[in-house]
């Protein structure tokens, strides 16, 4: 028969014959021959291959370096890489999460729209009319101004985006 020019899925062409790729978690030792199938061996401890492959070496699992603020979120297997995330209060600087930076705080006049995670920074938003934030915080949302009316008080000093209203007693008009 004619030697193949293309192979099926999960196969590769070598020396005019189709050999099976190694399954995830295994590396290639020897191509198939006329006598035997492809020879593959399992990846070792702290190694992985995540696809059907013809790699002769497995990849090393990512190291989550605590000196860079990293910790293991998900331990790697022979078929998956380790996933790193950042320590509490820090977030990754990139999608690959190779280092961490401190979460940003929202300045006075701004509140937290979305609290930071291990992979995303704090998202701040300006406090709209009727709301304020008087602290620099990575957690505090904008607080609504105090409602003087519900306390049977009146506004003595208007609120801003950084300060609450100041309430005071109503002036009692005598007849």
């Amino acid at each position: 028969p004619e030697p193949p020019t293309a192979c099926r899925e999960k196969q590769y062409l070598i020396n005019s014959q189709c050999c099976s790729l190694c399954q995830p978690g295994q590396k290639l030792v020897s191509d198939c021959t006329e006598f035997t199938e492809t020879e593959c061996l399992p990846c070792g401890e702290s190694e992985f291959l995540d696809t059907w492959n013809r790699e002769t070496h497995c990849h090393q699992h990512k190291y989550c370096d605590p000196n860079l603020g990293l910790r293991v979120q998900q331990k790697g297997t022979s078929e998956t890489d380790t996933i790193c995330t950042c320590e509490e209060g820090w977030h990754c600087t990139s999608e690959a999460c190779e280092s961490c930076v401190l979460h940003r705080s929202c300045s006075p006049g701004f509140g937290v729209k979305q609290i930071a995670t291990g992979v995303s920074d704090t998202i701040c938003e300006p406090c709209p009319v009727g709301f304020f934030s008087n602290v620099s915080s990575a957690f505090e949302k904008c607080h609504p101004w105090t409602s003087c009316e519900t306390k049977d008080l009146v506004v003595q000093q208007a609120g801003t985006n950084k300060t609450d209203v100041v309430c005071g007693p109503q002036d009692r008009l005598r007849a």
Epitope: T33, T36, E39, L41, G44
Partner: antibody, heavy 116, light 110 residues
Framework: QLQLQESGPGLVKPSETLSLTCTVS??????????WGWIRQPPGKGLEWIGN???????YYSPSLKSRVTISVDTSKNQFSLKLSSVTAADTAVYYC????????WGQGTLVTVSS | QSALTQPPSASGSPGQSVTISCTGT?????????VSWYQQHPGKAPKLMIY???KRPSGVPDRFSGSKSGNTASLTVSGLQAEDEADYYC??????????FGGGTKLTVL
Amino acid sequence: QLQLQESGPGLVKPSETLSLTCTVSGGSISSSSYYWGWIRQPPGKGLEWIGNIYYRGDTYYSPSLKSRVTISVDTSKNQFSLKLSSVTAADTAVYYCAKGFRFDYWGQGTLVTVSS
Amino acid sequence: QSALTQPPSASGSPGQSVTISCTGTSSDVGGYNYVSWYQQHPGKAPKLMIYEVSKRPSGVPDRFSGSKSGNTASLTVSGLQAEDEADYYCSSYAGSNNLVFGGGTKLTVL
């Protein structure tokens, strides 16, 4: 058809270093198989795995022989070699080279005697 | 790592079946499906008969079969023939690019 051939001195003195070479013909040492191994068999005894080498030089040795074994590769000559240091009479054996970790191709073996 | 355990000898008459065992641990035989069996005639190099527990290289008679249960692998030779008389060795992958052989079994055809 792939063929492997061991070569080297048949007699080595105690405390010296045993050196053998395996020449691969009928195929390249850096394609079709990427790992190559050494196995030995003392007279009248069983097989013992010595170690393997990746064609780019990474080595894997038997824990029991690790401190005395060096396996190297020369892709330009299509050869890989075994060195075993500080030999004693217990290292007298037929030494085989073979393909991969599965060992589907073997050399015919060479007897190395350790004696003064 | 210790050698895998094989019976020193086994025998059978022509036409019969013989099974040779190869016992290891969960770190080798039990941990991986990478058991091979080799046949060695006196003065010759070993020949691969079974790989990955039960696969036969083409050219090896189907009288030879392999299996595994737990930490023990087995080679069965059915329909024994005179030329099957030889030494048989098992080997197993033992993790971290390490291999271990069995001590060998001398098969006699009576």
